[in-house]
């Protein structure tokens, strides 16, 4: 008795494919050892055809694969383009030799089935339309035409030229002739369902002089495409259902026993389990669309189906496309926080992992929006301007070689709560979803800047101080000047560093920055923050206005700008989102379902940046106290 299990007998026809699953006991050794598929010879020797070590025999080249699923304790052998020569005895097994643990499989490949003479075979997927061609002689040109379906010895009429239609084919079958053709009629059957499969006979005329044609209709459920994805990575279902359903509502659903539960559709329905991590993107006017799901979980594995129907729900007899998604738990994508919490007026530092082999890729951060299909406009990127409404409070810090970049958002408001995506223009699997939860602040922020009304005068010296609590004593403190392409670290002076950590005086922990002399280009947002190595922590922001000595009125009212830093009024947040919408064309990389689109967004952002203000940090120098 072998502990390996699989199908004992597999039968198919020439040209078809088989997918043979072998089950093995769930042990660590079994999960990692070699898997093989070999053909049993008359001499008792079993010749390897394919193995998990990468071996592929000549006769299987280009038509076979072996995939191990350690989390399911199975491996699958896929063999395509079968011929009768593939008939034989095989073994699927585990071990370094072909004598280890195995299971015997008999494969029989027969010829395509024989049908009565003149039988035309039609193979169609569920939901599609078949056009059956019926030839007749001139003598029957004016005779009754019909199509019937064989049921045992009887043949039940489906449709005829007297306008009779069998009720089960109502609104689905039509009989017609094309142009001036006098020797052929056609029957269209649309919205095909499995029970339509069978042998049909079309007939012109009656009695012995009647012309008859046989048609064998095979109605297939679409072969699911197998998708193998890593835990925490992303998957894109590309759905192309054809022009005939271009104007119908589209959906993606997940098979659950006999039902298929809709995950998302174009009518606004969305499964809460996919909130924040799904996008449906129309591709063109021919009904093509794609659905992207990020942050894959173990429970996302299963059978998916996309389809189209005016109700946005699965409907028998409408075209579908199918996938089987496997989620590999041995993932290369690191586990990162899926929920980040912040408080109003505070800040968050979000670490976004990316493929370390692609350190030069463009990095982005976008805000998932729950409109009907979901969308994710870019808020910031390594070569993308920060979206309006986020100036002075959002920056992306790339850390080449570390396999991660950090996005900092400060001056938080409750409207910042929601889902955000980290993504790059490189490996599309590395897309992570973060839920940001912003609660009302109940205490003073950890970092405080003085003076809060920061107006500097050109030519003079201006010092600004950032007060930090003792818990940040050992961390690196920094000041940076925010610009559209990041926040550039400035020289600064840590007043508290001279004290010993034992006698930390809460009131005198200060890091200050001095502008000497103040220049016009010093105007803008400045951040005070703490970090430990590459790990960024709390930040706070202040707007420094710069005015001429002679003039009394600053360029921007600093009180207004800094009021926003403390708590943005609702009107302003609403205005921001409107402006963000207007700006979307600049930076929204078509919802990232297509990698080229992200690249385009990057290119365009690069172009914008070249013509914009790079935010020079010149003219700032540290205090030399």
């Amino acid at each position: 008795q072998s502990p390996i299990f699989g199908p004992q007998d597999v039968s198919s026809i020439e040209g078809n494919s088989v997918s043979i699953t072998c089950y093995y006991p769930d042990t660590s050794v079994n999960r990692h050892t070699r898997k093989y598929w070999c053909r049993q010879g008359a001499n008792g020797y079993c010749a390897t055809l394919i193995s998990s070590n990468g071996y592929l025999s000549k006769e299987y080249s280009g038509r076979a694969s072996l995939i191990n699923f350690p989390e399911n304790s199975t491996f699958v052998i896929n063999i395509a383009h079968l011929t009768q020569e593939d008939t034989g005895s095989y073994k699927c097994g585990l071990g370094t030799t072909n004598r280890g643990l195995f299971f015997d499989v008999s494969l029989e490949v027969s010829q395509v089935p024989e049908f009565p003479n003149d039988t035309h075979v039609y193979t169609k997927d569920i939901g599609r339309t078949v056009t059956i061609e019926c030839r007749f002689k001139e003598g029957n040109a004016h005779s009754k035409k019909s199509l019937c379906k064989k049921r045992g010895e009887a043949c039940e009429v489906v449709i005829d030229s007297t306008e009779y239609v069998d009720p089960s084919y109502k609104d689905r079958a039509i009989l017609f002739m094309k142009g001036t053709s006098r020797d052929i009629f056609y029957v269209n059957i649309s919205h095909l369902i499995p029970s339509d499969a069978g042998l049909y006979v079309c007939q012109a005329g009656e009695g012995p002089s009647a012309d008859k044609n046989n048609a064998d209709l095979q109605v297939l459920e679409p072969e699911p495409e197998l998708l193998y994805k890593d835990l925490r990575s992303s998957v894109t279902f590309e759905c192309d259902l054809g022009r005939e359903v271009a104007n119908d509502a589209k959906y993606l659903c997940r098979k659950n026993k006999e039902t298929c539960d809709v995950i998302i559709n174009t009518l606004g329905k969305r499964d809460p389990a996919f909130e924040g991590r799904i996008l449906l993107t129309p591709r063109d006017d021919n009904g093509r669309f794609s659905v992207l799901i990020t942050g894959l979980r173990k429970e996302d594995a299963g059978h998916y189906q996309c389809g189209a129907h005016s109700s946005g729900l699965p409907q028998e007899g409408w075209p579908v496309q199918a996938w089987q998604l496997f989620v590999n738990e041995e993932s290369t994508i690191p586990n990162s926080r899926s929920v980040v919490k912040g408080v109003t007026g505070g800040s968050v530092a979000i670490v976004c992992p990316y493929n370390p082999k692609e350190s030069s890729s463009l990095k982005y951060w976008c805000h998932w929006e729950a409109d009907e299909n979901g969308r994710c406009p870019v808020l910031v990127g390594t070569q993308a301007l920060v979206q309006e409404g986020y100036e002075g409070r959002l920056a992306l810090f790339d850390q080449p070689g570390s396999g991660a970049y950090t996005v900092i958002l400060n001056q938080l408001t409750t409207q910042d709560s929601g889902f955000y995506w980290c993504l790059t223009d490189g490996d599309s699997r590395w897309r992570t979803t973060i839920e940001l939860q912003v609660a009302e602040a109940t205490k003073k922020p950890d970092l405080e800047v003085t003076p809060q009304n920061a107006t500097a005068v050109i030519g003079e010296t201006f010092t600004i101080s950032c007060h930090y609590p003792c818990k940040f004593y050992s961390q690196e403190k920094y000041w940076c000047k925010w610009s559209n392409d990041g926040c550039h670290i400035l020289p600064s002076h840590d007043e508290g560093a001279r004290q010993s950590s034992v006698s930390c005086d809460q009131s005198s922990q200060i890091v200050s920055m001095t502008l000497n002399p103040v220049k016009k280009e010093d105007e803008g947002w400045y951040w005070c923050g703490v970090k430990e190595g590459q790990v960024y922590g709390e930040t706070t922001a202040i707007y420094v206005a710069v005015e001429e000595r002679t003039r009394g009125s600053p360029h921007i009212n600093p009180t207004d700008a800094n009021a926003r830093a403390k708590d943005a009024p609702e009107e302003e947040a609403m205005e921001s989102s409107v402006r963000e919408d207007e700006n979307k064309a600049n930076l929204d990389p078509r919802l990232f379902a297509d990698e080229r689109e992200i690249q385009n967004a990057g290119d365009q952002a690069q172009e914008n940046r070249a013509s914009g203000n790079a935010g020079s940090a010149g003219g700032q120098s540290g205090s030399s106290k």
Epitope: D9, S17, P194, A197, L220, E221, E223, P224, K257
Partner: nanobody, 129 residues
Framework: QVQLVESGGGLVQAGGSLRLSCAAS????????MGWFRQAPGKEREFVAA??????????YYADSVKGRFTISRENAKNTVSLQMNSLKPEDTAVYYC????????????????????WGQGTLVTVSS
């Protein structure tokens, strides 16, 4: 909804043969899986055989205890699955249940009862010595 009706059970002598049939009414399956399980008195229900299909491709699975003696087959047009049982032994005595799964894909391990969506009422097979 799919209903499964088993037939063909009865009393047979050891070494004899029986043919069980399971008819599925309702929707035609263009792909899916049907299987036979059995439950002997005082024992748990166990896997006997299964057949999966999609288009013209068929996969047949058997429990070690019935290999070479039982044969599972499917009649497409009638939506029925049969289990031909030869060389019957007294330990084959049990209630035999038919199970079905209607899916785009054959699914997981055919030996698992959770893999099936529909079940018949069962038919009793008694093998006397």
């Amino acid at each position: 909804q799919v209903q499964l009706v088993e037939s063909g059970g009865g009393l047979v002598q050891a070494g004899g043969s029986l043919r069980l049939s399971c008819a599925a009414s309702g929707r035609a399956f263009s792909s899916g899986r049907m299987g036979w399980f059995r439950q002997a008195p005082g024992k748990e229900r166990e896997f006997v055989a299964a057949i999966s299909w999609s288009g013209h491709t068929t996969y047949k699975y058997y429990a070690d205890s019935v290999k070479g003696r039982f044969t599972i087959s499917r009649e497409n047009a009638k939506n029925t699955v049969s289990l031909q049982m030869n060389s019957l032994k007294p330990e084959d005595t049990a209630v035999y249940y038919c199970a079905a799964r209607q899916s785009l894909v054959a699914g997981g391990d055919p030996r698992g009862q959770s893999e099936y969506d529909y079940w018949g009422q069962g038919t009793l097979v008694t093998v006397s010595s």
